[in-house]
C-alpha cells in the first residue's frame, strides 16, 4: 500500500477520505485506527456504526468522527481541531469478523496555524530533504508519500 | 431546518390497509434513514422499520413482518408506510423520524393518528 | 431482542431538584444509546446520543453517561418544562428498541 499524505494546520478540522470498491467490501464495516510504531499495532481510534445500513451516521471518538458511503465506496474521517500530537500514520480499514483489510494508509501531517505566532517547534512534517516537488496530489491538502520518505518521526 | 410534515388522521375497518406519508422539506432526503415508530394510546414508543432512500434498502422489525411496507419517493421527499390486515391493537399515533447526523432518530414529524375500529 | 428497562417507572420531584433516570440493558450495547423526551400531545425530542453527546439545542443541565448494559440521564436541576416522559433507545443492534419510559411527575 501506497502511503497517502492528508496536510491541515493546527487548530482547524482536517477531512480525509479512503476510496474503496464498495461491491468488494459489501456489508463490511469500516474503522479508523493509528499506527504504533513502525511494526506496532494499528490501535482503532473510531469505527463506523454497529449496524452496517446505518454506516452513513457520523459516529465520533472524542475529535474524530468517521463516516461511510457505503453505496460510494468512500470512508470519510474527521479530525476537529487538529493538535501537533494528531500528526502520524494512520490506517483505513474493512472489516470483516476480527480480520481487517486496510484501504488505505495515510500519513496526516499537522501544519503550523499562520495567523499563531507561537513558537511551531513542536509540529511534526517530514524533513525539507524529503521533497515534495513530484508528489502525486490528490486535492489540497493531501499527496502520496516518496518513495524514501520516512511515514514516522525521527525517533531520539 | 429539515421538517417532516406527516397525512392527516385516519380511521380504518378491521382487515383493512393504512398508507401513511411523511414528506421531508430541507436537508438531501435520499442520503439518510426514515424510521416509523408507533405509540398506542397510554403505551411506549415501538419501532417498526427504517428505509434507506438512497438504496431502497429497508429493514423492519420481526413484529411488523409481512405486514408493513416502507417505501420511500424521492422525487418528492417523502417516504411512506403501510400497514396491512388492521387489528384494533394497530390503535395508535405513528410517527415517522429522520436521521440528521449523528443517530436515527434525530427529527420527528407531529404524529398520525390511525384508529382501527369495526 | 435487546430490551431496555427503565427505573423508577415514575419520579416524583419538585422544581430545583436532580434527577436520576436510569436504564438497563439485557445485553451489552456499548455506547448505540440515546434518551428522547417526551411531552403530552407532542413527538419525541432527542435528548442525548451515543450515550452521552447532548443534541443540539438541548440545555446543559441535560447529561448523559454510562456504557455496556448501565445507563444513566441526569437534568441537574430540573424546570418546570421538564416534567414529561423520557425514553433510552438502542440501536446497536436490530430490531431497535426502546425502554418503556420514566415519567418525571411535580411533587
Known amino acids: 500500500h501506497n502511503t497517502t499524505v492528508f496536510q491541515g494546520v493546527a487548530g482547524q478540522s482536517l477531512q480525509v477520505s479512503c476510496p474503496y470498491d464498495s461491491m468488494k467490501h459489501w456489508g463490511r464495516r469500516k474503522a479508523w485506527c493509528r499506527q504504533l510504531g513502525e511494526k506496532g499495532p494499528c490501535q482503532r481510534v473510531v469505527s463506523t456504526h454497529n449496524l452496517w445500513l446505518l454506516s452513513f451516521l457520523r459516529r465520533w471518538n472524542g475529535s474524530t468522527a468517521i463516516t461511510d458511503d457505503t453505496l460510494g465506496g468512500t470512508l470519510t474521517i474527521t479530525l476537529r481541531n487538529l493538535q501537533p500530537h494528531d500528526a502520524g500514520l494512520y490506517q483505513c480499514q474493512s472489516l470483516h469478523g476480527s480480520e481487517a483489510d486496510t484501504l488505505r494508509k495515510v500519513l496526516v501531517e499537522v501544519l503550523a496555524d499562520p495567523l499563531d505566532h507561537r513558537d511551531a517547534g513542536d509540529l511534526w512534517f517530514p524533513g525539507e530533504s524529503e521533497s515534495f516537488e513530484d508528489a502525486h496530489v490528490e486535492h489540497s491538502i493531501s499527496r502520496s508519500l516518496l518513495e524514501g520518505e520516512i511515514p514516522f518521526p525521527p525517533t531520539s | 431546518q429539515v421538517q417532516l410534515v406527516q397525512s392527516g388522521a385516519e380511521v380504518k375497518k378491521p382487515g383493512s390497509s393504512v398508507k401513511v406519508s411523511c414528506k421531508a422539506s430541507?436537508?438531501?432526503?435520499?442520503?439518510?434513514?426514515i424510521s416509523w415508530v408507533r405509540q398506542a394510546p397510554g403505551q411506549g414508543l415501538e419501532w417498526m422499520g427504517v428505509?434507506?432512500?438512497?438504496?431502497?434498502?429497508?429493514n423492519y422489525a420481526q413484529k411488523f413482518q409481512g405486514r408493513v411496507t416502507i417505501t420511500a419517493d424521492e422525487s418528492t421527499s417523502t417516504a411512506y408506510m403501510e400497514l396491512s390486515s388492521l387489528r384494533s391493537e394497530d390503535t395508535a399515533v405513528y410517527y415517522c423520524?429522520?436521521?440528521?447526523?449523528?443517530?436515527?432518530?434525530?427529527?420527528w414529524g407531529q404524529g398520525t393518528m390511525v384508529t382501527v375500529s369495526s | 431482542e435487546i430490551v431496555l428497562t427503565q427505573s423508577p417507572a415514575t419520579l416524583s420531584l419538585s422544581p430545583g431538584e436532580r434527577a436520576t433516570l436510569s436504564c438497563r440493558a439485557s445485553?451489552?450495547?456499548?455506547?448505540?444509546l440515546a434518551w428522547f423526551q417526551q411531552k403530552p400531545g407532542q413527538a419525541p425530542r432527542l435528548l442525548i446520543y451515543d450515550a452521552s453527546n447532548r443534541a443540539t439545542g438541548i440545555p446543559a443541565r441535560f447529561s448523559g453517561s454510562g456504557s455496556g448494559t448501565d445507563f444513566t440521564l441526569t437534568i441537574s436541576s430540573l424546570e418546570p418544562e421538564d416534567f414529561a416522559v423520557y425514553y433510552c433507545q438502542q440501536d446497536y443492534e436490530w430490531p431497535i428498541t426502546f425502554g418503556g419510559g420514566t415519567k418525571v411527575e411535580i411533587k
Open positions: 423520524a429522520r436521521t440528521q447526523e449523528n443517530t436515527i432518530f434525530d427529527i
Open positions: 445485553q451489552s450495547v456499548s455506547s448505540y
Open positions: 430541507g436537508g438531501t432526503f435520499a442520503q439518510y434513514a
Open positions: 428505509i434507506i432512500p438512497d438504496s431502497g434498502t429497508a
